[in-house]
């Protein structure tokens, strides 16, 4: 699996999950999130050669097409597969509230 | 929606579905598919600016991060959203068989 366990331990050029720390205020301009100050959102990147963690029959077909037609611009792309939520603290006026934001942290990638 | 109805009618630079005809023999080397000879598989391409058909909160966050940090390599990617099957005819020896291959035709795209 192209997950954090594998990708963070290996120097993998092809599609894999990469570490990315985002500071809510500095990187997004989000002043409304009080805690945490930032988090590891991570991201997916790297080429998708034929059969590498293909998501659908279409991505398999497209990967093969791209291999046999390397000049073609059509190729699968490395995108998130498994995502996890992030719990944040925010305020309504002076009242603290806790919310779980879904699909905030990339744990693994796929070729789609 | 970034679907064939919209994308095939507009000169859209950003993420959209693009027409792509694949000939099974010539483009894939698949001699085993007897009918059809080829089909419109289509593919997704184009930049994913902030909020363009964002798939998850993570892709929204990543799009905003990329807007405010344009030198960063992390950005959402344009990938298939809705896919349709394709019915094919193949042979087992001299016995014709019909099979529906799932997720073969891209009908719309998203930024993931």
């Amino acid at each position: 699996a192209l997950d954090t366990n594998y990708c963070f331990r290996n120097l993998e050029e092809n599609c894999c999950v990469r570490p990315l720390y985002i500071d809510f205020r500095q990187d997004l301009g989000w002043k409304w999130v009080h805690e945490p100050k930032g988090y590891y959102a991570n991201f997916c990147s790297g080429p998708c050669p034929y059969l590498r963690s293909a998501d659908t029959t279409h991505s398999t077909v497209l990967g093969l097409y791209n291999t046999l037609n390397p000049e073609a611009s059509a190729s699968p792309c490395c995108v998130p597969q498994d995502l996890e939520p992030l719990t944040i603290l925010y305020y309504v006026g002076r009242t603290p509230k806790v919310e779980q934001l879904s699909n905030m942290v990339v744990k693994s990638c796929k070729c789609s | 929606a970034l679907d064939t109805n919209y994308c095939f009618r507009n000169l859209e630079e950003n993420c959209c579905v693009r027409p792509l005809y694949i000939d099974f023999r010539q483009d894939l080397g698949w001699k085993w598919v007897h009918e059809p000879k080829g089909y419109y598989a289509n593919f997704c391409s184009g930049p994913c600016p902030y909020l363009r058909s964002a798939d998850t909160t993570h892709s929204t966050v990543l799009g905003l991060y990329n807007t405010l940090n344009p030198e960063a390599s992390a950005s959402p990617c344009c990938v298939p959203q809705d896919l349709e099957p394709l019915t094919i005819l193949y042979y087992v020896g001299r016995t014709p068989k019909v099979e529906q291959l799932s997720n073969m035709v891209v009908k719309s795209c998203k930024c993931s």
């Epitope: 997004l28 301009g29 989000w30 002043k31 409304w32 944040i88 925010y90 305020y91 309504v92 006026g93 002076r94 509230k97 919310e99 934001l101 | 909020l51």
Partner: nanobody, 126 residues
Framework: EVQLVESGGGEVRPGGSLRLSCVVS????????IGWFRQAPGQEREGLGC????????WSADSVKGRFTISRDNVRNTVYLQMNALKPEDRGVYYC???????????????????WGQGTQVTVSS
């Protein structure tokens, strides 16, 4: 482009009512925080209350609690400040402010808002 335009100010007698409107444009659908502030002559800008456009969560300052109510109409992209039982000390210029980035919540602090309306004058006198 983000814009906030207030209206509804005017002159009213003590005990009277006014409803201020803040028309919001350039925000992502149903998202963002709107705060109401007022500035009396020679005083600092004071936070009166705020609302989260997504879920309608509101907060009101103690000085106006029970008299002022904030509501929103996401179809009309408008946030309202209903002011009842007005007092002479409620006079000043009233501003709405916006933070389009807020997925949840809203702030009582003016420094948290990037966008401001032009203000509308409220006078309370007999």
């Amino acid at each position: 482009e983000v814009q906030l335009v207030e209206s509804g100010g005017g002159e009213v007698r003590p005990g009277g009512s006014l409803r201020l409107s803040c028309v919001v444009s350039g925000f992502t659908k149903d998202y963002g925080a709107i705060g109401w502030f007022r500035q009396a002559p020679g005083q600092e800008r004071e936070g009166l209350g705020c609302i989260a456009r997504k879920d309608g969560d509101t907060w009101s300052a103690d000085s106006v609690k029970g008299r002022f109510t904030i509501s929103r109409d996401n179809v009309r992209n408008t946030v309202y400040l209903q002011m009842n039982a007005l007092k002479p000390e409620d006079r000043g210029v009233y501003y709405c402010a916006g933070d389009p980035s807020a997925l949840y919540g809203c702030s009582d602090r003016s420094s948290e808002y990037q966008y401001w309306g032009q203000g509308t004058q409220v006078t309370v006198s007999s």
